[in-house]
């Protein structure tokens, strides 16, 4: 049925569609939306309460250490490869994510202020 | 690109075991799930069993769970997959395949393990 | 485990024909639904992935439809290399399961 309606409202051949996404916690029914051109669809579906057990994270990923700071950006970052991934999780090979070079700095300096008023 | 290379044909008597190899070159052999499926003479796919070499958890079809064993070398990018007690029933072609959900699988070429007395 | 009845079992088209294959799952699958084409003597080799995404290599004439338990395999005008068995397959749920499989014939 759900099938039906996509294909009547829609002349659309080829729909894209998102991830399931649980309507609560992280497993069980759920939605996943579809576009094609201007037209979306809702459809209902199922994340495997059995697989998020099994495998956590979808996505999992081996970093290298921290770069040096970018006094441009005020920023560091870090290249992850994939190490394992969800069966069903379409995980980029390679990741990369930044910070601010600071926020260590910053909390470092805390602590010993901390420390010394103690 | 990945390529799977599998070992050589075998010919086995009924209620021996074989092992069959599949060596991975290219991209990262320990980031996908590989996956094992045979197909028996003139039938369809079946799956057996897939294995992570990252951490070797292994997730096994019941219906192989006391005739297949899947294992990996990290060190030499190798997957094998052994059967035990062999019957002529177990005649097929084994093939490796790695997955990964983003772009897709690559097959080894197969392995044809004929069972006969 | 998720039965995958596949129709029609054989399908007689000639080159330039569009082909229409299915794919029925016992129970909602999402979009975990695969396809793949099979020669003799080959590996198989993955056409569609998750119901409906294409694949690198794969030509523009193969597309799939999903999701839910009724899925599609077009060829939009066959080739004669297109004559060979397709398998669909799910990743649903444990174990994965393939389709009894459409074999593409000449007419």
């Known amino acids: 049925k759900k099938k039906e309606k996509v294909k009547k409202g829609s002349e659309c051949s080829e729909w894209t569609w998102g991830p399931c996404t649980p309507s609560s916690k992280d497993c069980g029914m759920g939605f996943r939306e579809g576009t094609c051109g201007a037209q979306t669809q809702r459809v209902h579906c199922k994340v495997p309460c059995n697989w998020k057990k099994e495998f956590g994270a979808d996505c999992k990923y081996k970093f290298e250490s921290w770069g040096a700071c970018d006094g441009s950006t005020g920023t560091k970052a870090r290249q992850g490869t994939l190490k394992k991934a969800r069966y069903n999780a379409q995980c980029q090979e390679t990741i990369r994510v930044t910070k601010p070079c600071t926020s260590k700095t910053k909390s470092k300096t805390k602590a010993k202020k901390g420390k010394g008023k103690d | 690109q990945v390529q799977l290379v599998q070992s050589g044909a075998e010919v086995k008597k009924p209620g021996a075991s074989v092992k069959v190899s599949c060596k991975a070159s290219?991209?990262?052999?320990?980031?996908?799930?590989m996956n094992w499926v045979r197909q028996a003479p003139g039938q369809g796919l079946e799956w057996i069993g897939m294995i992570h070499p990252s951490d070797s958890e292994t997730i096994l079809n019941q219906k192989f769970k006391d005739k297949a064993t899947l294992t990996v070398d990290i060190s030499t990018s190798t997957a094998y997959m052994e059967l035990s007690s062999l019957r002529s029933e177990d005649t097929a072609v084994y093939y490796c395949?790695?997955?990964?959900?983003?772009?897709?699988?690559?097959w080894g070429q197969g392995t044809l393990v004929t069972v006969s007395s | 485990e998720i039965v995958l009845t596949q129709s029609p079992a054989t399908l007689s088209l000639s080159p330039g024909e569009r082909a229409n294959l299915s794919c029925r799952a016992s129970?909602?699958?999402?979009?975990?639904l695969h396809w793949y084409q099979q020669k003799p003597h080959q590996a198989p080799r993955l056409l569609i992935k998750y119901a409906s995404q294409s694949i690198s290599g794969i030509p523009a004439r193969f597309s799939g439809s999903g999701p839910g338990t009724d899925f599609n395999l077009t060829i939009s005008s066959v080739e004669p290399e297109d004559f060979a068995v397709y398998y669909c397959?799910?990743?649903?749920?444990?174990?994965?399961?393939f389709g009894g499989g459409t074999k593409l014939e000449i007419k």
């Open positions: 397959q799910q990743s649903n749920s444990w174990p994965l399961t």
């Open positions: 129970e909602s699958i999402s979009n975990n």
């Open positions: 395949s790695s997955w990964s959900a983003k772009r897709g699988d690559f």
């Open positions: 290219g991209q990262s052999f320990s980031s996908y799930w």
